[in-house]
């Protein structure tokens, strides 16, 4: 698993929706596959954490200053839609084939 | 400034392009301002920091399980243009009006 | 080595027309601005006109003294540059130096062509 | 247009000496942290050739005993030590905005 010694990836996180209260409204799945983004962005920012011109900046802000400017921080820069089965205002169970931006498609460093 | 205990903001950070060994290759400006995005992205994220969705459920589940997974993290969400004069192929001092992604427009939550 | 070398120039009457030519060698010629550049005898430089690149649709701008009246035009495929002055005033005569550069300055500049306008 | 003005119109100078070569511009040439000024140094029968870009960097080639100084509408060109090559006509020129203009020239000579 990436900790905070290992470099900017897409690792595992099963987000239970009951655990975030959300089971009120989304019926089904129970649970789904969220993923994180872990790890360090360090210097040099590989090709595969597809940097912006200003984090490679800031990375080497960072190197020079390391207590005054943090580094570039490891985020989702792409997400992909789940399915969800969720009661509309009417209590009818109504099927979200694309409900956006909810679990992590890729990771890079910002 | 923002520290750790504050929300989620664009900050000040004057970058000179000799502390990154870039002033090898750009003539001018000397310095400029890239901004940094400083401070937390704590529950609950507030609309100013545009969060994802996937950032709203991470938070909910660091809310839960705080040693298990991180909070979401502010990033740059939105990059501006700076205009750099640089040496071409031949040595001819040219201008680039847009060397895009250089300096934070926006901050937010990812 | 970059060479601009500049022809066409000569005496010519008042109201007249002249068509000066610029060839360039030792650089890529269509990666690079191109301007005239003229200077009357014993005085100071004017830029008179230049044109940029293909993927400007070679955009021309002109010195308000010489707009329409010249016409600075490019060849890349023959590494070429060329003005075309029509309607020629006393107050044209100088040596027209033919420069390349970039949107930021004139790197390089070629001997110059001497133009007379004079009855 | 901006305008350019030089100052003196001419100078004479010893060798071994510094010489000072001041430029005006009517408005500031600056933009975006990068000044848009250069010097030209133009000897009889040749054409000119470019000094210092951006205020204040040497072009290919050029001594390191030309320097340029300056920014927004106040410009500087010293030459320290001055030498008997260096007897020629300097131009400022500005490229901000089109028209491109230049100063009307220094001649530099030897005292």
């Known amino acids: 698993s990436a900790g905070a010694g290992s470099h900017c990836q897409k690792t595992s996180l099963r987000v239970n929706f009951e655990d975030i209260g959300w089971d009120s409204w989304i019926i089904a799945p129970k649970e789904y596959e969220a993923y994180e983004c872990k790890g360090g962005c360090f210097f040099p920012l590989a090709d595969d954490v597809t940097p912006t011109k200003h984090a490679i900046v800031q990375t080497l802000v960072h190197l020079k200053f390391p207590t005054k400017v943090g580094k570039a921080c490891c985020v989702p820069t792409k997400l992909s839609p789940i399915s969800v089965l969720y009661k509309d205002d009417m209590g009818v169970p109504t099927l979200k084939y694309h409900y956006e931006g909810m679990s992590v498609a890729e990771c890079g460093c910002r | 400034s923002a520290g750790a205990g504050s929300h989620c903001q664009k900050t000040s950070l004057r970058v000179n392009f000799e502390d990154i060994g870039w002033d090898s290759w750009i003539i001018a400006p000397k310095e400029y301002e890239a901004y940094e995005c400083k401070g937390g992205c704590f529950f609950p994220l507030a609309d100013d920091v545009t969060p994802t969705k996937h950032a709203i459920v991470q938070t909910l589940v660091h809310l839960k399980f705080p040693t298990k997974v991180g909070k979401a993290c502010c990033v740059p969400t939105k990059l501006s243009p700076i205009s750099v004069l640089y040496k071409d192929d031949m040595g001819v001092p040219t201008l680039k009006y847009h060397y895009e992604g250089m300096s934070v427009a926006e901050c937010g939550c990812r | 080595e970059v060479q601009l070398v500049e022809s066409g120039g000569g005496l010519v009457q008042p109201g007249g027309s002249l068509r000066l030519s610029c060839a360039a060698s030792?650089?890529?010629?269509?990666?690079?601005?191109m301007n005239w550049v003229r200077q009357a005898p014993g005085k100071g430089l004017e830029w008179v006109a230049h044109i940029r690149l293909k993927s400007d649709n070679y955009a021309t701008h002109y010195a308000e003294s010489v707009r329409g009246r010249f016409t600075i035009s490019r060849d890349d495929s023959k590494n070429s540059l060329y003005l075309q002055m029509n309607s020629l005033k006393t107050e044209d005569t100088a040596v027209y130096y033919c420069?390349?550069?970039?949107?930021?300055?004139?790197?390089?500049w070629g001997q110059g062509t001497l133009v007379t306008v004079s009855s | 247009d901006i305008v350019m003005t030089q100052s003196p119109d001419s100078l004479a100078v010893s060798l071994g000496e510094r010489a000072t070569i001041n430029c005006r511009a009517s408005?500031?040439?600056?933009?975006?942290?990068?000044?848009?000024m250069n010097w030209f140094q133009q000897k009889p029968g040749q054409p000119p050739k470019l000094l210092i870009y951006?205020?204040?960097n040497q072009g290919s080639g050029v001594p390191d005993r030309f320097s340029g100084s300056g920014s927004g509408t106040d410009f500087t060109l010293t030459i320290s030590p001055l030498q008997a090559e260096d007897v020629a006509v300097y131009f400022c020129?500005?490229?901000?905005?089109?028209?491109?203009?230049f100063g009307q020239g220094t001649k530099l000579e030897i005292k």
């Open positions: 951006a205020a204040s």
């Open positions: 020129q500005q490229s901000k905005e089109v028209p491109w203009t």
């Open positions: 420069t390349g550069g970039s949107n930021y300055v004139f790197a390089f």
């Open positions: 408005e500031s040439v600056d933009n975006y942290g990068i000044s848009f």
């Open positions: 030792g650089f890529t010629f269509s990666n690079y601005w």
